[in-house]
């Protein structure tokens, strides 16, 4: 991809809007709705063209005073102060607060429910395919294939617990060794981080919000990818996870525990089970090569069944096949034995929407996928809106300080570790890292939590989900206890190893720097976020899967040159930023490459053309769809009939565009792509008050 995407020159155009550099008041003759800015009003106005908002190629003068786009926005309280209100006003304000809290909890509830249904939808659409990935015999010998299968299956079923439970059942059935299962678990860890990345896409309407939200979500992705990048080769070489966990499992005489407490599910299940109920055993059965399961539907029809155990006489080829010598007889021709047979009698149908439709899984899955994404998007918008109205002034200051401030010296370093514990605890409570990190994403977006603080919370979430798995393993039946516990411990120690790699020393906190870099690129070229999602969670795993199926030689033949080029580019990039004089003049920058190889600008033009056909059709999108629309089109202006998009359009027209000068980017991993970025002060995309 582009090592250093460039900024293009903007040709003046009298018909286009004008924009002042730095923080000046923009002059737009036709516009009456302008918001006066007080910062830098004395500075000379340099009028340059503001291209339509869907185009990201704009020449921006270097501002006199630079705002860090990663600084948290100040949420100004425009309302009347509490002390200035009369009794009636105070009562009204109090009830408004209560109402907002109820609404917030309500939307949060439906947000979590929609995540659950999204997972069900993914399982209906890709669950059977996911199960078939597991039945590939090459997993045993190829850890890379195991890894990508873990990623793909978890992405397809939107649940790492589903994919790990399949792995556990395969290990306890001796279809898979623990050694072969470890890369799959690593892959599942990566796959589970797609959920909050999808959630972050819902905040695409506001660039600065999107920058933070997307970076906050992808910090999880980068942590997982980097951990795998280092720990998979280490595991293949040393088998340290397998050895450590085996020692632990063998040294303790575990008794079967109780099931991990279902805390959040207790609240969400009554609602989600009215929408759809799935028979998740089908995926496991497919994974275990059960031919009959391939024709079964994942949609649960019968919820109340009567199981009648009875003994039937069956013929066996020889007396050796008898259940026991005493249960063996002959009729003079055939040998017979008695077999316990379980007859399942259907009594009552499930009470969910799709129970009587008899639609194929793909159809149900598609319907649920669209609906759950719409609800997810709608809830997210409303959560952000309510939080935006609640977290203002004093409240915001207190919350921000509480969450983002470190302990006093010399205990400042402990704050992050406390955040890890909080993340683990919260995830344990909600029983899902996806739910926790997805709930965190909008908070990062609106600027309540910094990425630096979200990072340890996310790492804690990774730990929390493994402790849940350990508890679940302890509740497993005897035959599955050892394998499920060992796999849960592998998962746990993998995350611990990852934390030790990428957290204790601030210099090693690469995921934060990479996520910020990606956040900057995605805020500028919003289509790149979708591109990133497809590439990292689908194309790369599918390519590796395909090459692995073709055999080791093909995989190595293609993989080695690709890895070599990546390493070469990274080394060159490092030398360019640290000691360019070592390099020949030609290699001191990327200008020797054609523009499409070093910049996203030509690609942006292609995407803009491609999405151009959607721009007019966007117009009648509803408020909830608006952000999804804007993601596709990158064009808030086209959604003219949508109130939130009109607000966005006006806000962007009346906005200054300060950008960091190249030297102010202290982080070498942040792409120069971001240097032509729209600011953190980019206006809110929110519609008017509730």
């Amino acid at each position: 991809m582009a090592p250093w995407p460039e900024l293009g020159d903007a040709q003046p155009n009298p018909d286009k809007y004008l924009e002042g550099a730095a923080g000046q008041q923009p002059t737009a003759p036709d516009k009456s709705k302008e918001t006066n800015k007080t910062d830098n009003t004395e500075a000379p106005v340099t009028k340059i063209e503001l291209l339509p908002s869907y185009s990201t190629a704009t020449l921006i003068d270097e501002p006199t005073e630079v705002d860090d786009p990663w600084n948290l926005p100040t949420l100004q309280d425009s309302g009347i102060k509490w002390s200035e209100r009369d009794t009636k006003g105070k009562i009204l304000c109090f009830f408004q607060g209560i109402g907002r809290l109820i609404l917030l909890l309500g939307f949060l509830y439906f947000f979590v429910c929609s995540l659950d249904i999204l997972s069900s939808a993914f399982q209906l659409v890709g669950g059977k395919m996911a199960g078939q990935f597991f039945s590939n015999s090459s997993i045993m010998s190829n850890p890379l294939l195991g890894l990508v299968i873990g990623v793909l299956v978890t992405v397809l079923v939107q649940s790492s617990s589903t994919s790990t439970s399949i792995v556990v059942s395969m290990v306890s059935s001796s279809l898979l060794t623990v050694r072969a299962a470890i890369p799959i678990i690593m892959g599942a860890n990566i796959g589970t981080s797609i959920t909050n990345t999808i959630v972050a896409l819902m905040q695409v309407g506001d660039r600065s919000e999107f920058r933070r939200a997307f970076a906050g979500a992808t910090v999880h992705d980068f942590f997982n990818w980097l951990s795998v990048l280092v720990l998979l080769p280490v595991e293949v070489a040393t088998h340290y996870l397998e050895i450590i966990t085996q020692l632990i499992v063998e040294s303790f005489h575990f008794k079967n525990g109780e099931d991990a407490p279902d805390l959040l599910k207790v609240i969400t299940k009554p609602f989600t089970k009215l929408i759809v109920q799935l028979d998740k055993k089908v995926i496991s059965q497919i994974a275990m090569n059960d031919e009959k399961a391939k024709n079964k539907s994942l949609v649960k029809i019968w919820c109340k069944t009567f199981t009648n155990k009875t003994q039937i006489n069956v013929t066996v080829p020889s007396t050796a096949n008898c259940t026991s010598p005493s249960l063996c007889w002959t009729d003079g021709i055939q040998n017979w034995t008695m077999k316990n047979v379980t007859y399942k009698e259907n009594i009552a149908k499930c009470q969910h929407i799709f129970v009587n439709f008899h639609l194929p899984d793909l159809a149900v899955g598609t319907i649920l996928l669209i609906l759950s994404l719409l609800v997810l998007c709608g809830c997210l918008i409303m959560i952000v809106k309510i939080l935006g109205s609640v977290l203002k002034g004093q409240v915001a200051t207190v919350i921000k300080k509480t969450i983002n401030t470190d302990f006093p010296f010399p205990f400042a370093w402990l704050t992050g570790y406390l955040a890890i514990l909080v993340g683990a605890g919260m995830t344990f409570i909600v029983q899902s890292s996806s739910v926790f990190t997805s709930a965190l994403t909008p908070l990062i977006g609106i600027g309540v939590i910094t990425i630096e603080r979200a990072y340890p919370l996310t790492l804690g979430s990774n730990i929390g989900t493994t402790t849940t798995a350990i508890l679940a393993a302890l509740a497993s039946p005897g035959n599955a206890l050892r394998s499920s516990l060992q796999i849960a411990l592998c998962h746990f120690f993998f995350n611990i190893s990852g934390i030790l790699l990428w957290y204790p020393i601030p210099f090693t906190r690469l995921p934060i720097r990479m996520a910020k870099g990606l956040g900057n690129i995605s805020a500028k070229y919003r289509w790149f976020a979708v591109f990133y999602l497809i590439i990292f969670f689908f194309l790369i795993p599918l390519t590796v899967f395909g090459l692995s199926l073709a055999g080791w030689r093909v995989l190595v033949g293609v993989g080695v040159p690709v890895v070599f080029i990546i390493i070469l580019v990274l080394c060159l990039r490092l030398l360019q930023s640290r000691c360019p004089r070592v390099l020949p003049k030609k290699l001191q920058n990327w200008n020797f490459l054609p523009l499409w190889m070093r910049s996203l600008k030509p690609w942006d033009a292609v995407v803009s053309k491609f999405t151009g056909c959607f721009q007019m059709r966007c117009c009648c999108c509803c408020r909830v769809c608006c952000r999804a629309c804007c993601l596709l089109c990158d064009c808030p202006k086209c959604c003219r009939c949508s109130k939130c998009c009109e607000d966005l359009e006006e806000a962007q027209e009346g906005q200054d565009v300060p950008v960091k000068a190249p030297e102010t980017f202290d982080n070498i991993t942040i792409s120069r792509e971001a240097q032509g970025e729209v600011p953190a002060s980019d206006s809110k995309t929110e519609c008017t008050a509730l």
Epitope: N313, S326, D331
Partner: antibody, heavy 120, light 107 residues
Framework: QVQLVQSGAEVKKPGASVKVSCKAS????????MHWVRQAPGQGLEWMGA????????SYNQKFKGRVTMTRDTSTSTVYMELSSLRSEDTAVYYC?????????????WGQGTLVTVSS | DIQMTQSPSSLSTSVGDRVTITCKAS??????VAWYQQKPGQSPKLLIY???TRHTGVPDRFSGSGSGTDFTLIIRSLQPEDVATYFC?????????FGGGTKVEIK
């Protein structure tokens, strides 16, 4: 009612063969196994083998393997038992017996028996 | 082959007496044992199968018990018409095998 009618007594020379028939009536012939049991004078019962008329599947006592052949004719609901290479110790009453107690080797209906005498 | 050893080989008792005939299998046959009654000059007749299940039309004075290798046929109150030879049979393995028989007479 169930009836198994066997062919009449036979006198054979050693080394010869004998073919005993058993005609079934009163039940669905092809459904139940037909067994052949012999009883030497003043001795106990000895199972020779069985045939399933539905498919013609047979099972023989290893002691008679190669000498005994059981066949059936579904059109006449008749089962045949042929014993070759007769010896004097083969002198016995040969019974055909049907097992209508499904899946068991317990024989509930017996023919009247056919006396086969092997004498030089 | 499974050997079925019957005892006694013969017994003489009075009408109304309780008669017990035992049968021992050379290996575990579960409950796949049947008992037959053969009157002089007649074909055998099934009395009991599955160790203790009476065949249709068999008087309830006949009962069977046992499992594994030891089996018993009991005639609770001997009647004159019960004079016959009694055979046990296993149908656990091919070939089916019969006991040597127990001849029951009235004094």
């Amino acid at each position: 009612q169930v009836q198994l009618v066997q062919s009449g007594a036979e006198v054979k020379k050693p080394g010869a063969s004998v073919k005993v028939s058993c005609k079934a009536s009163g039940y669905t012939f092809i459904t139940y196994n037909m067994h052949w049991v012999r009883q030497a004078p003043g001795q106990g019962l000895e199972w020779m083998g069985a045939i399933y008329p539905g498919s013609g599947d047979t099972s023989y006592n290893q002691k008679f393997k190669g000498r005994v052949t059981m066949t059936r004719d579904t059109s006449t609901s008749t089962v045949y038992m042929e014993l070759s290479s007769l010896r004097s110790e083969d002198t016995a009453v040969y019974y055909c017996a049907s097992s209508t107690i499904i899946t068991t080797g317990a024989v509930d209906y017996w023919g009247q028996g056919t006396l086969v005498t092997v004498s030089s | 082959d499974i050997q079925m050893t019957q005892s006694p080989s013969s017994l003489s008792t009075s009408v109304g007496d309780r008669v017990t005939i035992t049968c021992k299998a050379s290996q575990d046959v579960g409950t796949a044992v049947a008992w037959y009654q053969q009157k002089p000059g007649q074909s055998p007749k099934l009395l009991i199968y599955w160790t203790s299940t009476r065949h249709t039309g068999v008087p309830d004075r006949f009962s069977g018990s046992g499992s594994g290798t030891d089996f018993t046929l009991i005639i609770r109150s001997l009647q004159p018409e019960d004079v016959a030879t009694y055979f046990c049979q296993q149908y656990s393995r091919i070939p089916l095998t019969f006991g040597g028989g127990t001849k029951v007479e009235i004094k």
